[in-house]
């Protein structure tokens, strides 16, 4: 498994992982104590046939070509959690590992 | 976690799982001994904001709205394997659990 990494200067048109820092403060999400911001990343780009396909299923659906199947799109194929300290809405402060907050890899699915 | 299930008669426009039988014989894939066909399913439909979003990350990227982020797309969010008996191309027959061959649930990611 591998995926492309790009940045704002890249000319890559294919499915790629781009850097993105999420700033909770800028969103006005003041119930999050920490972190104030974190590197979330995101996926963007085109999914040509077979390029970076995560699943054999994606190829099979393309072969079968059913009505309404739009072809694969560029989406996270590997994600990881971050630890957060936050108010849970019941006047409690919680420390927890929140899953799927960081995109580690992008692919066509 | 939940997802919508549809069929060919559905009028649902949102992200949904549709039935699809993959027929290896129709593809000419004669290296596959068994199964000859299986129920693979596929995902199709629109991903309006927040509908069936699998990850909090999807919502955060929408909030941050970086250049080139296309918004979520309808994609498998839960998949399962099938057991296959096949020629591996080296005159050997192999039985293996092939991951991510069946779509169990669709969502916006």
């Amino acid at each position: 498994d591998f995926g492309l990494d790009c940045d704002e200067h890249s000319t890559e048109s294919r499915c790629c992982r781009y850097p993105l820092t999420v700033d909770f403060e800028a969103f006005g999400w003041d119930w999050i104590i920490a972190p104030k911001r974190y590197k979330a990343n995101y996926c963007s780009g085109e999914c040509e046939f077979v390029f970076l396909q995560k699943y054999p299923h994606t190829h099979l659906v393309h072969q079968a070509n059913p009505r309404g199947s739009a072809g694969p799109c560029c989406t996270p194929t590997k994600m990881s959690p971050i630890n957060m300290l936050y108010f849970n809405g019941k006047e409690q402060i919680i420390y927890g590992k929140i899953p799927a907050m960081v995109v580690d890899r992008c692919g066509c699915s | 976690d939940f997802g919508l299930d549809c069929d060919e008669h559905s009028t649902e426009s949102r992200c949904c799982r549709y039935p699809l039988t993959v027929d290896f014989e129709a593809f000419g894939w004669d290296w596959i001994i068994a199964p000859k066909r299986y129920k693979a399913n596929y995902c199709s439909g629109e991903c309006e904001f927040v509908f069936l979003q699998k990850y909090p990350h999807t919502h955060l990227v929408h909030q941050a709205n970086p250049r080139g982020s296309a918004g979520p797309c309808c994609t498998p969010t839960k998949m399962s394997p099938i057991n296959m008996l096949y020629f591996n191309g080296k005159e050997q027959i192999i039985y293996g659990k092939i991951p991510a061959m069946v779509v169990d649930r669709c969502g916006c990611s």
Epitope: - | D30, I33, N83, F87, E91, Q92, I93, Y95
Partner: antibody
């Protein structure tokens, strides 16, 4: 009803050749892999070969590799086993079988005797 | 090569008995295990495939279980027509191999 009928067995001298046939009916022959299995007199079962549905892929155990060749003619619904350089230990009843996850239908077999 | 060891090699039982035959693989074979019945002078007949799936047309008194290396064929209530030799076979990888057989005889 699935039917498999083997033919071509008989008495052959060591070093000789024989070609077995298996005529298939009652199913779409071209859709399924096929196998040959043999059974020496009073002994257990031994896999001999398998061929893919289209005939592109084959597999053999070391005991027959290089001497036996499996083939098929989908237009005639027939499976073949060409046996060369035959040895006394090849004496057995040879069965053809329709191959799925398992060998789900078998013919009645044809006896091959290798003896001088 | 994967060796398949069946036990017992033979057993005597009466009509109505519950009979259990075991098959052990020399390495893990997942659920790629099949069971066949063979009567004298006849071709083998598939009973169970993929360890526990009953082949179409086979009576429900036959059942299979197990995964990995240890497998079992059970006949819940032995019938007169069940006296035969039973073979296990792995389809996990080539060479495809059979167990040595278990002969079920009338007590």
């Amino acid at each position: 009803e699935v039917q498999l009928l083997e033919s071509g067995g008989g008495l052959v001298q060591p070093g000789g050749s024989l070609r077995l046939s298996c005529a298939a009916s009652g199913f779409t022959f071209s859709s399924y892999a096929m196998s040959w299995v043999r059974q020496a007199p009073g002994k257990g079962l031994e896999w001999v070969s398998t061929i893919s549905s289209g005939g592109s892929y084959t597999s053999y155990p070391d005991s027959v590799k290089g001497r036996f060749t499996i083939s098929r003619d989908n237009s005639k619904n027939t499976l073949y086993l060409q046996m060369n350089s035959l040895r006394a230990e090849d004496t057995a009843v040879y069965y053809c079988a329709k191959q799925d996850y398992a060998m789900n239908y078998w013919g009645q077999g044809t006896l091959v005797t290798v003896s001088s | 090569d994967i060796q398949m060891t069946q036990s017992p090699s033979s057993l005597s039982a009466s009509v109505g008995d519950r009979v259990t035959i075991t098959c052990r693989a020399s390495q893990s074979i997942s659920t790629a295990l099949n069971w066949y019945q063979q009567k004298p002078g006849k071709a083998p007949k598939l009973l169970i495939y993929s360890a526990s799936s009953l082949q179409s047309g086979v009576p429900s008194r036959f059942s299979g279980s197990g995964s990995g290396t240890d497998f079992t064929l059970t006949i819940s209530s032995l019938q007169p027509e069940d006296f035969a030799t039973y073979y296990c076979q792995q389809s996990y990888s080539t060479p495809l191999t059979f167990g040595g057989g278990t002969k079920v005889e009338i007590k």
